[in-house]
Interface confidence: medium
Amino acid sequence: KLTIESTPFNVAEGKEVLLLVHNLPQHLFGYSWYKGERVDGNRQIIGYVIGTQQATPGPAYSGREIIYPNASLLIQNIIQNDTGFYTLHVIKSDLVNEEATGQFRVYPELPKPSISSNNSKPVEDKDAVAFTCEPETQDATYLWWVNNQSLPVSPRLQLSNGNRTLTLFNVTRNDTASYKCETQNPVSARRSDSVILNVLYGPDAPTISPLNTSYRSGENLNLSCHAASNPPAQYSWFVNGTFQQSTQELFIPNITVNNSGSYTCQAHNSDTGLNRTTVTTITVYAEPPKPFITSNNSNPVEDEDAVALTCEPEIQNTTYLWWVNNQSLPVSPRLQLSNDNRTLTLLSVTRNDVGPYECGIQNELSVDHSDPVILNVLYGPDDPTISPSYTYYRPGVNLSLSCHAASNPPAQYSWLIDGNIQQHTQELFISNITEKNSGLYTCQANNSASGHSRTTVKTITVSAELPKPSISSNNSKPVEDKDAVAFTCEPEAQNTTYLWWVNGQSLPVSPRLQLSNGNRTLTLFNVTRNDARAYVCGIQNSVSANRSDPVTLDVLYGPDTPIISPPDSSYLSGANLNLSCHSASNPSPQYSWRINGIPQQHTQVLFIAKITPNNNGTYACFVSNLATGRNNSIVKSITVSASGTSPGLSAGA
């Protein structure tokens, strides 16, 4: 099939294009080119007869067209009007016609663009700037570059007018950059020269240096002022409100007490019309001034931060003194003084370090004290406390829980039920509760300043039925005549009566037995071995009652004065001596024997076979209870007689 290929398809003005013919039939008589999509004699460009090799221009011939024997058409010096369709009409020898159409598009060679701006000196935070890429060109694409990067995404940057205009709203000093625009079409791409945006800003609040504000008579005062500004600021100095000079630096030699006062630096930007001032108070001392304390950390965090308190002003050859809570400094590894005593450092502050702190400067006549300074130590939160302490509630009542945790600043509270956040309040209130309000209630205390959080979890059970109670004890092994024991009946429940039984009987009347905490706690003072009984607590309300399992009190006692048996003290020679020692004690004591003061064996029974008069003497049994820490002993005299010398003597065992 006869086809036309345009090479190239997109043609730049002034260049040339070749309309290349493919699949040209054999046995041709001739062919003709026409402008447009159809054969129209009025729009014939050129005709060609093969037999005569004769080319004949038509009405649309411009003199820029060349036809080739293969029917291709070259058009030179392309102009915008050349855009469009071209039709080749082929006449075969048998006079049968064939047609094909091709096309190309003409684009101008783009000129180098330039940027125009509606505001050459925009003011920061006030003005908008609109950059426009010139010239306006049909069928061109516009692109923008900032510092040779594509445009950042910003709500303050807006493209409009087919991307030809870039608007910067509320310019800031950070918008000072190199801006370029680029135009593109299918045949060319051109970039503009850079335009530097000159944003007027400032002046910012000036900074006066040095920061030192205390001077002694006779020193030179040299103050310098600086404020960020475009164009650079103009500076003026005022002392106590009176204009001094228009310079960036203020120099006063050999100052006196009269030079004390407020020193103001004023920065002025003539383009923005703005003024900013900073004031510093300069104090010139003739003699040691009243000191004052500065701190490097006004809100230290407990157990984390150190605080350095410095006694101002710095005066050469001066003795500095410190007081805490109106006392001289205590000895503490957490308190450190600098070599000149001017700086007191508290390492790892605690909530007890609030002070007040005072420093003093010693002169020839007296000590000048600073005003007291109190530290605001941030601490906590500690573990929160949930009140009331009830864990068991009856359906239908109101549940009102309050949470508190020691904290500075005061903690912010959150409540969670079963791990799910409920509300951000210190109090949690649920009216008319039912069993489904049972759950794990967590209070979370958060200190926004330290960033620390602590939680406490409380189990709340809502039930008409009371649970089986249990007994907790503050002392599982009390010592007789020394310790007290407090039994507590768990859980703590609202509107509940607590009862106690000892060995299945109601409580005996005794000054050593005391009920407290709504009968929930039973305290036994000065326990005795007779208190080692089975204790049961019970809970009851109008619906149900329940008893705990018994808890048996294990009282540690003894050892009591031991008893040596048998009681005999006279023996016949040749008998066996078999002495047994026993002492009431819990736990069982350790036994040991001494004969005439000489340690023997650590057994409860002492056995000596076939004794003789040499075994006469004092036999002592020693008992000790490691649990009570108590000891006891008894001494027995044993007399051994020669056989047959005295009637009534024991034969021994």
Partner: antibody, heavy 124, light 110 residues
Framework: QVQLQESGPGLVRPSQTLSLTCTVS????????MHWVRQPPGRGLEWIGW????????EYAPKFQGRVTMLTDTSKNQFSLRLSSVTAADTAVYYC?????????????????WGQGSLVTVSS | DIQMTQSPSSLSASVGDRVTITCRAS??????????MHWYQQTPGKAPKLLIY???NLQSGVPSRFSGSGSGTDYTFTISSLQPEDIATYYC????????FGQGTKLQIT
């Protein structure tokens, strides 16, 4: 004595609505969150959702959202499950259950009281 | 929602053996000092039965040979000495958000 009993048709046609009722005895359902859990044959347990019979509040598993409805009749101490547009994949044993107070520590959502289960087959 | 991965899916053990099943959550199911993980036993044709609640608490009436432990995302269920009546499928379930169950572990006796 606490008891939960599921009831409803054992056979449901595809694209129809499955309906089950759970009848509770031994406690007032208004005091508990009531749940439905199902178990396809030979497969694991799937939680469907809960209803608070006191106020009709519900929460459903995302898988069933849009197909499931839970209702309650507190006068009869009953709650029900409706699952629409069923397919063979909905064939399962359906259990109603709740968190009781048999533990000293109580919390949503573990289940210590269950019905015996009701097998529902989806088939034409 | 939180996904539960239970392993193994089945296991065989002898009477008296110590048996351990693990369950891993796709994110932590612990909050405010508690772990919201529970374990159930299901015998064929019966409803599941709660054994362990809040990771380690033994449900009333459940033998002490059953125990649970873990926090965060990783949890373990243990039978200290396997008995013939322990043949069942065991499921873990979390309640940190809307509940989901593990896929189950089928326990058989060799």
């Amino acid at each position: 004595q606490v008891q939960l009993q599921e009831s409803g048709p054992g056979l449901v046609r595809p694209s129809q609505t499955l309906s089950l009722t759970c009848t509770v005895s031994g406690f007032n359902i208004k005091d508990y969150y009531m749940h439905w859990v199902r178990q396809p044959p030979g497969r694991g347990l799937e939680w469907i959702g809960w209803i608070d019979p006191e106020n009709g509040d519900t929460e459903y598993a995302p898988k069933f959202q849009g197909r499931v409805t839970m209702l309650t009749d507190t006068s009869k101490n009953q709650f029900s499950l409706r699952l629409s547009s069923v397919t063979a994949a909905d064939t399962a044993v359906y259990y109603c259950n709740t968190r009781g107070l048999s533990t000293m520590i109580t919390t949503r959502w573990f289940f210590d009281v269950w019905g015996q289960g009701s097998l529902v087959t989806v088939s034409s | 929602d939180i996904q539960m991965t239970q392993s193994p899916s089945s296991l065989s053990a002898s009477v008296g053996d110590r048996v351990t099943i693990t369950c891993r959550a796709s994110k932590s199911v612990s909050a405010s000092g508690y772990s919201y993980m529970h374990w159930y036993q299901q015998t064929p044709g019966k409803a599941p039965k709660l054994l362990i609640y809040l990771a380690s608490n033994l449900q009333s009436g459940v033998p002490s040979r059953f125990s649970g432990s873990g926090s965060g995302t990783d949890y373990t269920f243990t039978i200290s000495s396997l008995q013939p009546e322990d043949i069942a499928t065991y499921y873990c379930q979390h309640s940190r958000e809307l509940p989901t169950f593990g896929q189950g572990t089928k326990l058989q006796i060799t």
